[in-house]
């Protein structure tokens, strides 16, 4: 299971991966 693009809704922003666009996002970051 590839979780490399998962963006936490409530955790630290430090692990946000820079992806090339919205098509790569799995969860909308709040």
């Amino acid at each position: 299971l590839d979780l490399s693009n998962v963006q936490s809704k409530c955790g630290s922003k430090d692990n946000i991966k820079h992806v090339p666009g919205g098509g790569s996002v799995q969860i909308v970051y709040k």
Partner: antibody, heavy 120, light 112 residues
Framework: QVQLVQSGAEVKKPGSSVKVSCKAS????????ISWVRQAPGQGLEWMGE????????YYNEKFKGRVTITADKSTSTAYMELSSLRSEDTAVYYC?????????????WGQGTLVTVSS | DIVMTQSPLSLPVTPGEPASISCKSS????????????LAWYLQKPGQSPQLLIY???TRESGVPDRFTGSGSGTDFTLKISRVEAEDVGVYYC????????FGQGTKVEIK
Amino acid sequence: QVQLVQSGAEVKKPGSSVKVSCKASGGIFSDYVISWVRQAPGQGLEWMGEIFPRSGSTYYNEKFKGRVTITADKSTSTAYMELSSLRSEDTAVYYCARDYYGTSFAMDYWGQGTLVTVSS
Amino acid sequence: DIVMTQSPLSLPVTPGEPASISCKSSQSLLNSRTRKNYLAWYLQKPGQSPQLLIYWASTRESGVPDRFTGSGSGTDFTLKISRVEAEDVGVYYCKQSFYLRTFGQGTKVEIK
């Protein structure tokens, strides 16, 4: 309130390089992407590339790859766009914009623009 | 590359009348996981920097008048102005951010 303030107008010779700066205030600089967009006289908007200051990671428009370099200095909340091997067709207004990364991926704040004129 | 095509390129309007701009993408802008279309609309007024009007195809940016409405999904999108006002003149651009960023050619809205 986020504000993006760009450096002043430049006149450059063909073959030279230009470096435009974009200083951000308000908000947390490293939490969003800075995109660079240009507009030639009387033409539309053209996306050049972007940087995620937190990591320094960049993406570029294939059209400009090899000629454009986007960097960021987190300590001064400033992004830079350097374009090399300038030609007359690069005469344009260059904008930086905050790209609301991770949510809308939309550019919600824009700099005032920097006119770069390439002329011999 | 994702290509964005706007129509019409020029739109003469009468104040108080509705106006509509179409934007088509060469591939779908819908992310099935987030259920969002990564399509935004911008207005560039004469002599100004562009300003964000709509994101996620239909979400109005804060402070944007409710006469502006974005709709559509996948590859076909529309920006509607319910009643055009004089201050709405300028060039409207759609932009995809599904993969990298691409702007449409722009639609110039001017008063008849």
